[in-house]
């Protein structure tokens, strides 16, 4: 069967919205970098749709994307990074819309990990420790960090502390003795990269300690 | 309406240094790719240099890799090209270029000379 729209599908391809998000990984799987383009209509039926690069690209001209599910992704070392790019969402030979883009500028970091909370006994505090991909990067290396904590049992309230180093210390007397926390982090590209928040880290979760009634302080 | 001017070239002996500079009056300045360009007498224009908008990523042609360095200041709309080892084959008119979209600089400088006698 052809890839290409017959008369009536492409009549009714053109009622239909398809704007789209993307947003590229650089160094994501070594030296390649990755692009990843959605259509923010989840509804909208993609049979025959496909999306395409081209422009500042080395060594070729276009790039197809490939269909997984419902996003289109390419992985490659051909991104020049450099300059404004045309992806569009094609339909045989046909445009249905189009958008330029700078690669630099929609990047979403990896999420962090390893992240972990030690509590600290003479220092009544809580040093907060997790690692990110993008410290052996040669792109986006300088990332601000979002770091989220809540005592587990209030839902949807969440602290949250920017920060640009991967460490950070909680001091005790701001969290609420012998109770359960639930902490994560994300990052977005700070210096030289624009673009989004990554994936949240997998949560860490840890107790804060008793008060001791005599001294009034933790246990 | 003059809006990218180069300046910097000159006469310089083989194995000297020049430093060109390109400066903006284009509002997209700081969102916008740079690059430099030449053309040798008889000879089509080459590419040597571009930088991204932020100036974290940069592309050299082989001729110049290594001897070339470029570099931007979005405070000041300019972007530089800093060029060592000379040879004489780097004799021409160097072109300043704005706005990398699709495979097309979109503006171009009027050039300055650059003649490297041995």
């Known amino acids: 069967e052809s890839g290409y729209a017959q008369n009536g599908d492409l009549e009714d391809a053109e009622l239909d919205d398809y704007s789209f998000s993307c947003y590229s990984q650089l160094e994501v799987n070594g030296s390649q970098h990755s692009l990843t383009c959605a259509f923010e209509d989840p509804d909208v039926n993609t049979t025959n749709l496909e999306f395409e690069i081209c422009g500042a690209l080395v060594e070729v001209k276009c790039l197809n994307f490939r269909k997984l599910q419902e996003i289109y992704f390419i992985e490659t070392k051909k991104f020049l990074l450099i300059g404004k790019s045309n992806i569009c969402v094609k339909v045989g030979e046909k445009s249905l819309t189009c958008k330029k883009i700078d690669l630099t500028t929609i990047v979403k970091p990896e999420a962090p990990f390893d992240l972990s909370v030690i509590y600290r006994e003479g220092a009544n505090d809580f040093v907060v420790t997790f690692n990110t991909s993008h410290l052996q990067k040669k792109y986006v290396k300088v990332l601000m960090h979002d770091v989220a904590y809540r005592q587990e049992k209030d839902e949807n309230k969440w602290t949250h502390v920017n920060l640009s180093s991967t460490k950070l210390t909680l001091l005790q007397r701001k969290l609420q003795p012998a109770a359960m926390y639930e902490i994560k982090v994300r990052s977005i590209p700070d210096h030289y990269f624009k673009g989004f928040w990554s994936e949240w880290s997998p949560s860490y979760y840890f107790r804060t300690p008793e008060i001791n009634n005599s001294s009034g302080e933790m246990d | 309406e003059v809006q990218l001017v180069e300046s910097g070239g000159g006469l310089v002996q083989a194995g000297g240094s020049l430093r060109l500079s390109c400066e903006s009056s284009i509002s997209t300045f700081s969102s916008d790719a740079m690059g430099w360009f030449r053309q040798a007498p008889g000879k089509e224009r080459e590419f040597l240099s571009a930088i991204g908008w932020s100036g974290a990523v940069t592309h050299y042609s082989d001729s110049v890799q290594g001897r070339f360095t470029i570099s931007r200041d979005n405070a000041k709309n300019t972007v530089y090209l800093q060029m060592n080892s000379l040879k004489s084959e780097d004799t021409g008119r160097y072109y300043c270029?704005?706005?990398?979209?699709?495979?097309?600089?979109?503006?171009w400088g009027q050039g300055t000379q650059v003649t490297v006698s041995s």
């Open positions: 270029a704005e706005d990398y979209d699709t495979d097309v600089w979109q503006y």
